[in-house]
């Protein structure tokens, strides 16, 4: 239903849009897991921490982020039926003081300590790919999605309309 | 276009209640979240309390155990029921919503003209 090409007619803009203000419009705490169901959880390993996609035992207990939600400052007003709203940017911090960075160079998603104002690589724009299912798309690269890859997260280039709705770029959030 | 409309605002005592409702209308296809914000002359806008799409809420510290957010995914309709109401919540109310449309999965923030909540004897 969403070719590509409408995808970077809303964020061919990313690379130079700015966040307004420097405080969030909301936050709240969710897991967050693939489409598949599998979680994803954070551990600390050697003073650094560590992204894993992982079937969790039953009763086990899921790992929280904390999701921001900031506003970009120009209004996305390109859209065919006159949508006035200012498009959404993430960022998700599993603990505090670190923050989900997408590095770019490498294809990787990491965990950095920081601090704020945050750097461009931790703001993903948030899409609504598929029912209950949410997508993660880079500020610094638009058509690169955070996505599943042998068990890891990595950003992965999304180049076709049918590679939008792909299991490995959607997640579920959830507050339970 | 997205709309949000506001209502039930007004002027209640100190300790009374108030509920406020706010309806969302357009061509939405997916609402990730709806909450409230509030601006008090001569401050910057606030969150109250926001509720997402999994039912998950969460609330301004001066709020809690006073202020309660509801939802209805049926109609787009997101609900604030406000007890034990103080001067200090004397302030604009804004509805605010987080959607994608029929025509793009961009999530986008929009938000209501506000409605005005006084407390005062």
């Known amino acids: 239903a969403f070719g590509i090409s409408g995808v970077q007619k809303y964020t061919r803009a990313l690379h130079d849009s700015s966040i307004t203000g420097i405080s969030p419009i909301t936050e709240y705490l969710a897991s967050l897991s693939t489409y598949n169901d599998q979680s994803i959880t954070f551990a600390l390993e050697d003073e650094s921490y560590e992204i894993y996609v992982e079937d969790l035992k039953k009763d086990e207990k899921k790992d929280k982020v904390l999701l921001s939600y900031y506003e970009s400052q120009h209004p996305s007003n390109e859209s065919g039926d006159g949508v006035d709203g200012k498009m959404l940017m993430v960022t998700l911090s599993p603990t505090k003081d670190f923050w989900l960075h997408a590095n770019n160079k490498e294809h990787s998603v990491e965990l950095h300590k920081c601090e704020k104002p945050l750097p461009d690589q931790a703001f993903f724009v948030l899409h609504n790919m598929h029912s209950n299912c949410v997508s993660f798309e880079c500020k610094t690269d638009p058509g690169v999605f955070i996505g599943v890859k042998d068990n890891h997260l990595a950003l992965i280039k999304v180049d076709s309309s049918e590679n939008l709705c792909t299991e490995n770029i959607l997640f579920k959030l959830s507050e339970t | 276009e997205v709309q949000l409309v506001e209502s039930g605002g007004g002027l209640v005592q100190p300790g009374g209640s108030l509920r406020l409702s706010c309806a969302a209308s357009?061509?939405?296809?997916?609402?990730?979240?709806m909450g409230w914000h509030r601006q008090a002359p001569g401050k910057q806008r606030e969150l109250v309390a926001v509720?997402?799409?999994?039912?998950?809420?969460n609330y301004a510290d001066s709020v809690k155990g006073r202020f309660t957010i509801s939802r209805d995914d049926t109609k787009n309709t997101v609900y604030l029921q406000m007890n034990s109401l103080r001067a200090e919540d004397t302030a604009v109310y804004y509805c605010?919503?987080?959607?994608?449309?029929?025509?793009?999965?961009?999530?986008?923030?929009?938000w209501g003209q506000g409605t005005l909540v006084t407390v005062s004897s």
């Open positions: 605010n919503a987080a959607a994608s449309t029929y025509s793009s999965t961009v999530v986008r923030s929009f």
């Open positions: 509720v997402t799409s999994g039912g998950g809420t």
């Open positions: 357009g061509s939405i296809r997916t609402v990730n979240y």
